[in-house]
């Protein structure tokens, strides 16, 4: 008899995922020299007793506890780079810019970027059909809650002048329920950040409007201003320019507004 | 429930080294739980971190200080130590310890929890 299983909303297990993990695990620790103490083994083991046998609807933070402990990695608190709706070119601009830093550049953000995990009550199987979408579903799943934990913990960490990367061609510049928007923003901490500073990227060749004076934006420097966090705001309208002139800031063409 | 306590001089000469105490009880200073860290606010100005000390003993230390600057642990005290020498008047600040979580993501400016503070004066 075929046994009942519970259907989902959203995507399955990413394929391989457990493989995938480990094999993620040890590329990070061979590439980070400060990482190589990782047993990733035991990280594997952490990760899947976060959420193997449990609702997938009721993962709390304190399930990724033993993982975080062994996922412990020190980022240079003023180099940290946020970012919403925009991460390809975030990750593009800390391959180039390596002393800056996304979450995704960190251990346990490396582990868990474009992946989907979920399990089944009782049982220790990963669920390969579908995980439960955060909002048809629940939001207290394997992946939001994943998510969540590390990102408070990495907007914790920041200090002095904190970067975030916005993308300009969406209807909201900042999403208020965004993980910047509702995490991130709010686990800034105001005695040790002094300013946020945000890069709104540009899509269109030929856009030349101010988008730091869009409603959303306004919104964004209000939340921070009353958090006692000074804002400011850049257009990057080139983009592809952006990239090149990080690269090779010496180039002539560089002095001029990108 | 962690709790820090600083001791040390309020009045320091210039040139001397200031040297302060940290006195933790509610938990181990040894423990991989947490990481350490001083921290100080001059008359009118941000809070700045000084330096900060992790679980198996490296340490980090505000590049603007870093000369001067020395941060230990004893473990048979419970006890986190800050040196800072050849000190001026602009060195003049309240003086805090804190300690943060020591798990995933973590930077240099330990802010979990924090002592009442201490006033050092550099003064002849």
């Known amino acids: 008899v075929p046994r009942w299983r519970q259907q989902w909303s959203g995507p399955g297990t990413t394929k391989r995922f457990p493989e995938t993990v480990l094999a993620r695990c040890v590329k990070y620790t061979e590439i980070h020299p400060e990482m190589r103490h990782v047993d990733c083994q035991s990280v594997w083991d952490a990760f899947k007793g976060a959420f193997i046998s449990k609702h997938p609807c009721n993962i709390t933070e304190e399930d990724y506890q033993p993982l975080m402990k062994l996922g412990t990695q020190t980022v240079p608190c003023n180099k940290i780079l946020l970012w919403s709706r925009i991460k390809d070119l975030a990750h593009q601009f800390t391959q180039v810019q390596r002393d800056m830093f996304t979450l995704e550049d960190t251990l346990l953000g490396y582990l868990a970027d474009d992946l989907t995990w979920c399990g089944e009550f009782n049982t220790s199987k990963i669920n390969y059909q579908s995980c439960p979408d955060w909002r048809k579903d629940c939001s207290n799943n394997p992946v939001s809650v994943f998510w969540k934990t590390v990102s408070r913990r990495f907007a914790e960490a920041a200090c002095d002048v904190v970067h975030v990367m916005l993308n300009g061609s969406r209807s909201k510049i900042f999403d208020k329920n965004s993980t910047f928007g509702s995490v991130e923003v709010h686990n800034l901490q105001p005695e040790k950040v002094q300013t946020l500073e945000a890069w709104v990227i540009h899509g269109g060749r030929e856009d030349s409007r101010d988008l730091c004076q869009d409603p959303t934006i306004k919104e964004l420097e209000s939340i921070i201003s009353k958090r006692n966090i000074q804002f400011s705001c850049k257009n990057i309208y080139r983009p592809d320019k952006f990239l090149q002139c990080v690269k090779n800031p010496e180039d002539s063409s560089c002095t001029s507004e990108i | 429930q962690l709790q820090l306590q600083e001791s040390g001089p309020g009045l320091v000469k210039p040139s001397e080294t200031l040297s302060l105490t940290c006195t933790v009880s509610?938990?181990?200073?040894?423990?991989?739980?947490?990481?350490w860290g001083w921290i100080r606010q001059p008359p009118g100005k941000r809070l700045e971190l000084i330096g900060s000390i992790y679980y198996g003993g490296s340490t980090y230390y505000n590049p603007s200080l870093k000369s001067r600057v020395t941060i230990s642990v004893d473990t048979s005290k419970n006890q986190l130590s800050l040196k800072l020498s050849s000190v001026t008047a602009a060195d003049t600040a309240i003086y805090y310890c804190?300690?943060?979580?020591?798990?995933?993501?973590?930077?240099?400016?330990?802010?979990?929890?924090r002592g009442q503070g201490t006033l050092v004066t550099v003064s002849s």
């Open positions: 509610g938990g181990s200073i040894s423990s991989s739980s947490y990481y």
């Open positions: 804190a300690g943060g979580y020591n798990y995933g993501p973590v930077g240099q400016w330990p802010s979990d929890y």
